[in-house]
C-alpha cells in the first residue's frame, strides 16, 4: 500500500535587498499564463546563481509570490507582475507561501519524519 | 526539458539581411522567456535580445538595437531573430537560449548565467 503524499503550507516575510543585477529571480503565472492548474497565482520558476534571492537563502523554486512591498499580487497579468517586481524598488519585501511536501506512511503506520513517539 | 534547434545562418554581405530561427520542444513554451547570444571567435558568449513568453516584452544589447529584431510564434514554438543591416563584426555564432519564467530584472544586465537551455549554434559569416 503507497503512502498519502501531503503538504505543509506556510507563509513568510522575506526582505531582499535588490543586487547589482536585481533580484536574482524568474516568476511564472498571472490571469493570463496560468502554469498551476486552476491557479493564476505568481510562483517562482528560478533562482539565479549568486543573485540576491539566492544569497538570502530564503526564496525557493516553487513558492507562491502573494504580495511585493505590500500589494497583492492576485488577479494580476504576467506581465504586470513582471512590471511590479522590476519597479519596487531598492528594498523589496515578500510575503510567499512555501508549499513543502511531506510523504506519510501507509495507514496505520508511522511515516518517516512523523512528529509522534 | 527543452531542446533548441537554430537555423538561418550563413554568409552575408556586409549590410545585408538575415533570418535566424529557433525551433523549441515543449508543451508550455509560452512560459519560457527565450534569448539570442553571440560568440565570436576567441571571445565569450553574449548577450543579444530576448523576448518574454508572451512577446510582450522585448530587450536588445546596445551593439544590435535598431538593426535586429526578435520575435515569436507561440503556436509554432519558433523564436526568430531578425538581423538587417548587418556589420563584419556582427560575425559569430549565434545561439538559441530558454528559460522558465521572467527575469524579474530587467534585461540591461543579461548573462549566460540567466538561461538553463541551449541550442548547438549557427555560423552567421560577414563579408
Known amino acids: 500500500m503507497n503512502g498519502r503524499v501531503d503538504y505543509l503550507v506556510t507563509e513568510e516575510e522575506i526582505n531582499l535587498t535588490r543586487g547589482p543585477s536585481g533580484l536574482g529571480f524568474n516568476i511564472v503565472g498571472g490571469t493570463d499564463q496560468q502554469y498551476v492548474s486552476n491557479d493564476s497565482g505568481i510562483y517562482v520558476s528560478r533562482i539565479k546563481e549568486n543573485g540576491a534571492a539566492a544569497l538570502d537563502g530564503r526564496l525557493q523554486e516553487g513558492d507562491k509570490i502573494l504580495s511585493v512591498n505590500g500589494q497583492d499580487l492576485k488577479n494580476l497579468l504576467h506581465q504586470d507582475a513582471v512590471d511590479l517586481f522590476r519597479n519596487a524598488g531598492y528594498a523589496v519585501s515578500l510575503r510567499v507561501q512555501h508549499r513543502l511536501q511531506v510523504q506519510n506512511g501507509p495507514i496505520g503506520h508511522r511515516g518517516e519524519g512523523d512528529p509522534s513517539g | 526539458e527543452v531542446q533548441l534547434v537554430e537555423s538561418g545562418g550563413g554568409l552575408v554581405q556586409a549590410g545585408g539581411s538575415l533570418r535566424l530561427s529557433c525551433a523549441a520542444s515543449?508543451?508550455?513554451?509560452?512560459?519560457?522567456?527565450m534569448g539570442w547570444f553571440h560568440q565570436a571567435p576567441g571571445k565569450e558568449r553574449e548577450f543579444v535580445a530576448e523576448i518574454s513568453g508572451t512577446g510582450g516584452n522585448t530587450g536588445y544589447s546596445d551593439s544590435v538595437k535598431g538593426r535586429f529584431t526578435i520575435s515569436r510564434d507561440n503556436a509554432k514554438n519558433t523564436v526568430y531573430l531578425q538581423m538587417n543591416s548587418l556589420k563584419l563584426e556582427d560575425t559569430a555564432v549565434y545561439y538559441c537560449?530558454?528559460?522558465?519564467?521572467?527575469?524579474?530584472?530587467?534585461?540591461?544586465?543579461?548573462?549566460?548565467?540567466?538561461?538553463?537551455?541551449w541550442g548547438q549554434g549557427t555560423q552567421v559569416t560577414v563579408s
Open positions: 537560449a530558454a528559460v522558465l519564467g521572467s527575469p524579474t530584472d530587467s534585461s540591461d544586465y543579461r548573462s549566460t548565467l540567466d538561461y538553463d537551455y
Open positions: 515543449g508543451r508550455t513554451f509560452s512560459s519560457y522567456t
